[in-house]
């Protein structure tokens, strides 16, 4: 009787979760005389294991970040000890959980700007990195301003891109910071994983300082 | 301990057939293959079959049997579980098959001849 | 089939002298598939070697085993009278299993 975990060697891919500890077998491959044993060789990191009747499984929790596709070979071998079918390729791809936090890559940040400068324009980028897959929304990073200080009349003088880190003026930093008035501020930049959408996403903090430098350009006179 | 216990000489005649015996002990006989070999007088030696004595019946068994191809319709393996021996069977006797045959068991550990019967003196004469 | 060269066929060596036995194989195999065997006239073969370099249970430690690839030998340190047999080399890679012609080897 084949099914969903037995059958004849063929070439497959299975998809396992990591972190999870076994709790079942990952496929029963069936023997055909003259074979009467199986042979697991390739990147098994001494996680995955064939018993002699066909049984593949694992021994302990897979790790995406150590190694996100196990390709294996599985063959079939005789009484002897001689491949009689196989080797045939098994691939095990480890799908990501979110097991890794977001880290900043500086835990403080110096940057400078001159006053009037382009709304938008970034002039300092902050980078954080996470292990998980960027593909899915484990490793998709969130940036945000958490604090400016000084904040005066609560307004924000600066904004972040959300998705790159990048730090610009806002229409109203541009059009009103003085190095004269305020010649430095601080902002705490918080990171998120998940998109930033999740109560279950990591997060990091950095702080950045900026200095506010004199627009020397002077329009000319008429 | 492990013997391999080979049946006596045989003189007999050509086109005639003649079965060999090795009734093994000291371990459990379908564990490991038997394997059959071949010496002819001041020659080498010559790997002729195997055979895997899984299960007691003849059909089954035969799934688990393995023939250098020079020997194959020349020999014929065959095993008792009940009786732990296995048999090779030589037919269509020539001058040629005139030699000394050995059977030997397959250690599934590094996979060698680890042990080997005392050998059957086969003559083929008229 | 896999071709099993031995060389030399025969070969006479005095009491104490070092004695190396070639086995030249016809297609590479793995270390572990190479296995020598000693026979003394009017008996069976005895493992003596296998995986190309394990002594058989009750080998002397004289013996040695080396090789890989297409290319293995047998030494023997030191001869002595016992020794003087013929020794064979066999493969366990591919059906058919092949052995090579042998080694007669005599004491001077």
């Known amino acids: 009787q084949e099914g969903k975990f037995s059958g004849p060697l063929k070439p497959m891919t299975f998809s396992i979760y990591e972190g999870q500890e076994p709790s079942q077998i990952i496929f029963q491959f069936k023997a055909n005389p003259p074979a009467v044993t199986f042979e697991l060789t390739g990147e098994t990191d001494n996680i995955f294991v064939i018993e002699r009747e066909g049984l593949l499984y694992y021994n302990r929790a897979l790790d995406r970040e150590t190694r996100s596709t196990h390709n294996l070979q599985v063959a079939a071998l005789d009484a002897n000890g001689i491949i009689v079918e196989g080797p045939v390729p098994i691939t095990i791809k480890v799908k990501d959980i979110n097991d890794n936090r977001p880290t900043f890559l500086q835990s403080k940040y110096e940057g400078s700007v001159r006053q009037n400068s382009r709304p938008g324009k970034p002039f300092l980028y902050v980078n954080a990195t996470d292990l998980d897959d960027p593909a899915t929304p484990n490793g998709q990073l969130y940036y945000q301003i958490v604090i400016q200080l000084p904040m005066i009349n609560n307004v924000m003088y600066f904004q972040i891109n959300n998705k790159t880190g990048a730090i610009s003026l806002t229409r109203e930093g541009s059009q009103e910071l003085n190095p004269a008035k305020n010649p430095s501020y601080n902002l705490v930049i918080s990171v998120k994983d998940m998109g930033g959408q999740s109560e279950n996403s990591f997060s990091d903090t950095t702080s950045v300082d900026i200095i506010v430098t004199e627009n020397i350009w002077k329009a000319p006179k008429p | 301990q492990v013997q391999l216990q080979q049946s006596g000489a045989e003189l007999v005649k050509p086109g005639a057939s003649v079965k060999i015996s090795c009734k093994v002990s000291?371990?459990?006989?379908?564990?490991?293959?038997i394997h059959w070999m071949k010496q002819r007088p001041e020659q080498g030696l010559e790997w002729i079959a195997y055979?895997?004595?899984?299960?007691?019946?003849?059909?089954?068994?035969?799934?688990?049997?393995g023939y250098n191809e020079k020997f194959k319709g020349k020999a014929t393996l065959t095993a008792d579980t009940s009786s732990s021996t296995a048999y090779m069977q030589l037919n269509s006797l020539t001058s040629e098959d005139s030699a000394v045959y050995f059977c030997?068991?397959?250690?599934?550990?590094?996979?060698?001849?680890?042990?080997w019967g005392q050998g059957t003196t086969l003559t083929v004469s008229s | 089939d896999i071709v099993m060269t031995q060389s030399p066929t025969l070969m006479a060596a005095s009491p104490g002298e070092r004695v190396t036995i070639t086995c030249s194989v016809s297609s590479s195999i793995r270390s572990s598939n190479l296995h020598w065997y000693q026979q003394k006239s009017g008996t069976s073969p005895k493992p003596w070697i296998y995986?190309?370099?394990n002594l058989a249970s009750g080998v002397p430690v004289r013996f040695s085993g080396s090789g890989s690839g297409t290319s293995y030998s047998l030494t023997i340190s030191s001869m002595e009278a016992e020794d003087a047999a013929t020794y064979y080399c066999?493969?366990?890679?591919?059906?058919?299993?092949?052995f090579g012609s042998g080694t007669k080897l005599e004491i001077k």
């Open positions: 995986g190309t370099s």
């Open positions: 030997a068991r397959g250690y599934r550990g590094f996979f060698y001849f680890d042990y």
């Open positions: 066999q493969q366990w890679s591919s059906y058919p299993f092949t």
């Open positions: 055979i895997y004595p899984r299960d007691g019946s003849t059909n089954y068994s035969e799934k688990f049997t």
């Open positions: 000291g371990y459990t006989f379908t564990d490991h293959t």
